[in-house]
Amino acid sequence: EVEKTACPSGKKAREIDESLIFYKKWELEACVDAALLATQMDRVNAIPFTYEQLDVLKHKLDELYPQGYPESVIQHLGYLFLKMSPEDIRKWNVTSLETLKALLEVNKGHEMSPQVATLIDRFVKGRGQLDKDTLDTLTAFYPGYLCSLSPEELSSVPPSSIWAVRPQDLDTCDPRQLDVLYPKARLAFQNMNGSEYFVKIQSFLGGAPTEDLKALSQQNVSMDLATFMKLRTDAVLPLTVAEVQKLLGPHVEGLKAEERHRPVRDWILRQRQDDLDTLGLGLQGGIPNGYLVLDLSMQEALS
């Protein structure tokens, strides 16, 4: 807390300008009117205040707005945003995407801080859902943003927002998150033709069920191995050798390099060695000829 002292004669600030950088902390406290500061917040960023001076300015705004800053002030906080705590931000009501962008710009190039996470959370909750424009903005600043959300939070993403998602935005998503996103993507892209559809849906396929993979195998999509390796193991296991061959097209020879990695390893164990041999890739580990395969899960279901 800065002690309350009278402003020296002739030092009362008429506007927020560069002369204030020569003010001591107590002079800023005594001579800068909080209401003036609030209306001229846009000027603060252009002035090279010290961290200590910024603390004083924040203190003045806190006194003026104990219930939380209005959006007109928030939008122009600039570097003063870095002084805010998550507790401060929880008092705000940010509704404008421009305000959000302005504050994200301040933190650009850095990891998502607790302040930014709180800001985004407040903004999204205020909007009720993660709309396309918001998602566009957030993923532009933080490509990993989408994958930082829980499956529950992702369920509020409307299918129309999926158009804003780029492949790199899904790089760090786990299978549970893709399980939520895939049906939304399928819905969003449903009116596209075969090859265009595959380009768009490809990044989401880690959430695709077996029947969708079987359908894709009939469409000459030529899935690359990087995509194939991201598929759910339980979705890949029921695919036949012929279906995998059609799904991968010319990339099928890549199975050899991945034969020890999931899901290829587990898929190989489920195939007849005879069928694997038809690929001519030297894949080993299939079910030997003459062996009978019992599906115990089916037997349990019948009993």
Epitope: L225, K256, H261
Partner: antibody, heavy 119, light 108 residues
């Protein structure tokens, strides 16, 4: 430009462990497996194992089972190899190398980290 | 495991000379699964030839690769000073992946 940046030389005592980072840049980290190779004067190049960054699924050359542990941190596009219970036999240059998923050749190699085990 | 034996271990060639390096496998390797790396002293290895005969990006056309089964080779049609280096063959047909012991090629 695609780069695999490894840490500088390590001088470690017998019995100790060392963790070597390999920071990837200039490409989509999850489209490539990360393989590790040992190069020593006596034995030439030896494949240690690989890791798939999507699934953290690892495969090891049996010879290095229990000796090497491979991990990745997707958020920082960094692969790591930890070597434990070091002996003079482990003195070598260790390389990370990327391998496009679905191929078996290493199209980009790291800068290499020299590990010297000596008391 | 598949053992790859390279010969000769060390050799030198004159400028313009044709050079052939060989790599012999202890058991059959599918040609798609064999490649070659080049390594200059003090540097990391670099991919030189993949799938037996495909030149990696930036590799001069004087290099070529051939072979099948257990016998593979790398050929330089006309030796140049910058080709002096060690060359290693590598197979990924079987686990564990293995490398040849290398051929150290010098300039006469």
């Amino acid at each position: 430009e695609v780069q695999l940046q490894q840490s500088g030389p390590e001088l470690v005592k017998p019995g100790a462990s060392v963790k070597i980072p390999c920071k990837a840049s200039g490409y989509t980290f999850t489209d490539y497996n990360m393989d590790w190779v040992k190069q020593s004067h006596g034995k030439g190049l030896e494949w240690i194992g690989d890791i798939n960054p999507n699934t953290d699924d690892t495969i090891y050359n049996q010879k290095f089972n229990g000796k090497a542990t491979l991990t990745v941190d997707k958020s920082s596009s960094t692969a790591y190899m930890e070597l434990r219970s070091l002996t003079s036999e482990d003195t070598a240059v260790y390389y990370c190398s990327r391998r496009l998923i679905g191929t078996g050749y290493f199209d980009v190699w790291g800068t290499g980290t020299t590990v010297t085990v000596s008391s | 495991q598949i053992v790859l034996t390279q010969s000769p271990a060390i050799m030198s060639a004159s400028p313009g000379e044709k050079v052939t390096l060989t790599c012999s496998a202890s058991s059959s390797v599918i040609s798609t699964y064999l490649c070659w790396y080049r390594q200059k002293p003090g540097s990391s290895p670099e991919l030189w030839i993949y799938s037996t005969s495909n030149l990696a990006s930036g590799v001069p056309a004087r290099f070529s690769g051939s072979g099948s089964g257990t016998s593979y080779s790398l050929t330089i049609s006309s030796m140049e000073a910058e080709d002096a280096a060690s060359y290693f063959c590598h197979q990924w047909s079987n686990y564990p992946y293995t490398f040849g012991g290398g051929t150290k090629l010098g300039m006469k």
